[in-house]
Interface confidence: medium
């Protein structure tokens, strides 16, 4: 799911799904601007008062992060500049099943996205030989 | 082998104008934004432009406003720089780099001189 | 904009030593700061990027350190191909600046 248009920028998102106890990530992916220092990325959770993640002027702001998601996420800072805004979540929980947002703002307007997390305990299938 | 060829450069006049190219191979040249630098004889490298992945995102150095012009087409893997009103200060080797991380893939420069 | 300050501009070593070149940002850049080598007539190579991180295939010799408008480029025991002109550049926000460049030469 994404939004474009006049003062709208194009973000993408992939459901996807996490291990319990495991590490997973939450992909979102948007035309980068440049200028690093013009990004802003929040992730937010539905029904989840506070922020899942934010990275703004170049580095992590937690100042908003709602409790139950402390210590557990980061953004691939590196990858920041080439549109990658997707999230590292550590040690997936149940409870961290749920729809996310992923929104983008830079210098050329604002955008987002929706994705649907689940949440398991995901095995590899057995390859019989 | 991720590679960036520039060509395009020459000697002009004062005033005329010149169309830069650099061609990518090697990597997915359109999900990456672009650079073009360049350093004039005997000093240091100054940035010149830069184009986001899917142009949405276009920036110039103070010095080359109006008067150069970025571009790329994703479709030929080739990034453009076009100069025109060129000046003696704009004589310099221009190299393209590639932004990720840093300028991590860069050209191996090509030379523009203005003189008369 | 953004005003990078090198130092030394030029430095004189013999291989094997440890040098240290600095770069001082006028206003801060998080971590957003790159370090290049060049080479007399050949285009400029990325040797450390956000301030820290070795490039890939870049000899563990060199380290960067810093944040916000301190940043040091130390190269731990010089080797005979070391002997170049170093810059640090701001990633952070358009106009990207580079330092003016610090030639180290050989002793």
């Known amino acids: 799911f994404g939004i474009s248009g006049k003062h709208f920028i194009t973000v993408t998102t992939f459901t996807s799904a996490g291990n319990i106890g495991e590490d997973g990530t939450l992909s979102c992916t948007f035309e980068p601007d440049i200028k690093l220092n013009g990004i802003v990325i929040q992730w937010l959770k539905e029904g989840i008062k506070g922020l899942v993640h934010e990275f703004k002027e170049g580095k992590d702001d937690l100042s908003q992060q709602h409790e139950m998601f402390r210590g557990r996420t980061a953004v691939f800072a590196d990858q920041v500049v080439v549109g990658n805004a997707s999230l590292r979540l550590k040690n997936v929980q149940l409870t961290d099943a749920g729809t996310y947002t992923c929104y983008i703002r830079t210098s050329k307007g604002k955008g987002n996205a929706n994705l649907e997390y689940k949440t398991g305990a995901f095995s590899m299938p057995e390859i019989n030989v | 082998e991720v590679q960036l060829l520039e060509s395009g450069g020459g000697l002009v006049q004062p005033g005329g104008s010149l169309r830069l190219s650099c061609a990518a191979s090697g990597f997915t040249f359109s999900s990456y934004g672009m650079h073009w630098v360049r350093q004039a004889p005997g000093k240091g490298l100054e940035w010149v432009a830069s184009?986001?992945?899917?142009?949405?995102?276009?920036y110039y150095a103070d010095s080359v406003k109006g008067r150069f012009t970025i571009s790329r087409d994703n479709s030929k893997n080739t990034l453009y720089l076009q100069m025109n009103s060129l000046r003696a200060e704009d004589t310099a080797v221009y190299y393209c780099a590639r932004a990720s991380s840093g300028m991590d893939v860069w050209g191996q420069g090509t030379t523009v001189t203005v003189s008369s | 904009d953004i005003q990078m300050t090198q130092s030394p501009s030029s430095l004189s070593a013999s291989v094997g030593d440890r040098v240290t070149i600095t770069c001082r940002a006028s206003q801060t850049i998080r971590s957003y700061l790159n370090w290049y080598q060049q080479k007399p007539g050949k285009a400029p190579k990325l040797l450390i990027y956000a301030a820290s991180h070795l490039q890939s295939g870049v000899p563990s010799r060199f380290s960067g350190s810093g944040s916000g408008t301190d940043f040091t480029l130390t190269i731990s025991s010089l080797q005979p191909e070391d002997f170049a002109t170093y810059y640090c550049q701001q990633s952070y926000t358009t106009p990207y600046t580079f330092g003016q460049g610090t030639k180290l030469e050989i002793k």
């Open positions: 184009i986001s992945s899917s142009s949405g995102y276009i």
